[in-house]
């Protein structure tokens, strides 16, 4: 919290930044519709004045819809509900009769559009366990829109993996919903050799879908289990 600092009138001093470390990161991306706050806390004697430039030119209220707000006592400028046209370089110029300093922030305004689900690479991971053991598959989902998660396994019917239509037989083991806790995790307990095979994490939202799979190897009891390397 940096406010104006009163200094002895005899100690004349050119403007200076009160905390240069905080001003090292210059490029900032902000989601559209949010608010941006620029600050350039400074000291000096006499107390410096502050003005703002956008892309090297005087920044005027009429340069953006809704204008902007300034609080000189906090060395700050606020722009509400930013839009892509607010992108640019914002420079605070702090000056008194003994000198002038400036600092530029590079603002990028990003418009977020919903996308199909993204699944973290490498998940679910292949796993192995002994007969009677437990195993857990994890699927990490990133989705703007509400995702629907399904855990699916290829199964056989009457000794066949494929139906008359040529499509594989699939069994939904778990799916997201009110009665399903933590749909991103599929836990298998007391596994048998029949549980071996491919497990698919399928995630969909209203835009699209994505899926990734992992293999479970079930070992005889005398072999030690271990997580396979990718």
């Amino acid at each position: 919290a940096e406010d104006f600092v009163s200094e002895n009138s005899n100690n004349k001093r050119a403007p200076y930044w009160t905390n240069t470390e905080k001003m090292e990161k210059r490029l900032h991306a902000v989601p559209a519709a949010n608010t941006v706050k620029f600050r350039c806390p400074a000291g000096g004697n006499p107390m410096p004045t502050m003005r703002w430039l956008k892309n090297g030119k005087e920044f005027k209220q009429e340069h953006r819809i809704g204008g902007y707000k300034v609080r000189n006592q906090h060395w700050s400028l606020i722009m509400e509900s930013v839009v892509p046209s607010d992108k640019g370089n914002y420079t605070c110029v702090v000056e008194n009769e003994y000198g002038s300093i400036n600092h530029t922030y590079h603002l990028d305004v990003v418009e977020r559009s919903p996308h199909r689900p993204i699944l973290q690479a490498g998940l679910p991971a292949n796993a192995s366990t002994v007969v009677g053991g437990d195993v857990e598959f994890v699927c990490k989902v990133y989705s703007d829109a509400q995702p629907h998660i399904q855990w699916i396994k290829h199964v056989e019917k009457n000794g066949s993996k494929y139906g008359p239509d040529g499509l594989p037989y699939l069994k939904v083991l778990k799916h997201s919903g009110i009665n399903s806790s933590n749909a991103e995790v599929l836990a298998l307990f007391n596994v048998t050799e029949a549980d071996a095979g491919e497990y698919i994490c399928k995630v969909s939202n209203y835009i699209g879908q994505a899926n990734q799979s992992a293999w479970l190897t079930v070992l005889p009891k005398q072999q030690a289990p271990g997580r396979e390397k990718e």
Epitope: H28, N34, T35, F38, R39, Y105, Y142
Partner: antibody, heavy 127, light 107 residues
């Protein structure tokens, strides 16, 4: 005009579950966030949690962590508060509020401000 | 958690009075402080954000000041519609926390 309408409140037994909905209109849903705030009868405001509608990230108060889940369906412009393992002390009016970020580029953190609120829905946990 | 303490808890005032409510944070919250107004049976309304910025549509008789740990909400000339409960709220720390509220009543 920005509007938020909560629904789903009611009477539930301790240990039970309830899902509250917050239907939003009048703004670009994925640009900002939704917070849930509750107010026990005759008491002050308590922040419950928040979701950022763009990336789906969530934050929760310690008092509800592990029991409550905030989610959103952007196709329906609706946010949800799934409340499990409910306790008597969860009895309150629950508000949803549009939440935008003030991105302070100097200190590199985001201040969250709740600018539009729903009318609230009452949740009573009692046997 | 950051504790927010408001004072006074309640006050009685008349229309036209100048009213000041203070809010103290248990640790530095910089300028990350908002003020809300709530009438009985209604949802809160945002008045001030970032300690001193007036939210759009809020009358100019409301003002906020302060930084760090000490903050003030001032109503320069109290109007009949201003009788309500006022809450401060910080969001620099997790979790966001509210003050206990200050009830402004008619004298």
């Amino acid at each position: 005009e920005v509007q938020l309408v909560e629904s789903g409140g009611g009477l539930v037994q301790p240990g039970g579950s309830l899902r509250l909905s917050c239907a939003a209109s009048g703004f670009t849903f994925t640009s900002t966030g939704i917070s849930w705030v509750r107010q026990a009868p005759g008491k002050g405001l308590e922040w419950v949690g928040r979701t950022h509608l763009g990336d789906g990230s969530t934050n929760y108060a310690d008092s509800v962590k592990g029991r409550f889940t905030i989610s959103a369906d952007t196709s329906k412009n609706t946010a949800y508060l799934q409340m499990n393992s409910l306790r008597a002390e969860d009895t309150a009016v629950y508000y949803c509020a549009r939440t935008y970020g003030i991105y302070d580029l100097y200190v590199d953190y985001t201040e969250y401000v709740m600018d539009y609120w729903g009318q609230g829905t009452l949740v009573t946990v009692s046997s | 958690d950051i504790q927010m303490t408001q004072s006074p808890s309640s006050l009685s005032a008349s229309v036209g009075d100048r009213v000041t409510i203070t809010c103290r944070a248990s640790q530095d919250v910089d300028t990350s402080l908002a003020w809300y107004k709530q009438k009985p049976g209604k949802a809160p309304k945002l008045l001030i954000y970032s300690a001193s910025f007036l939210y759009s549509g809020v009358p100019s008789r409301f003002s906020g000041s302060g930084s760090g740990t000490d903050f003030t909400l001032t109503i320069s000339s109290l109007q009949p519609e201003d009788f309500a409960t006022y809450y401060c709220q910080q969001s620099t720390g997790h979790p966001q926390t509210f003050g206990q509220g200050t009830k402004v009543e008619i004298k």
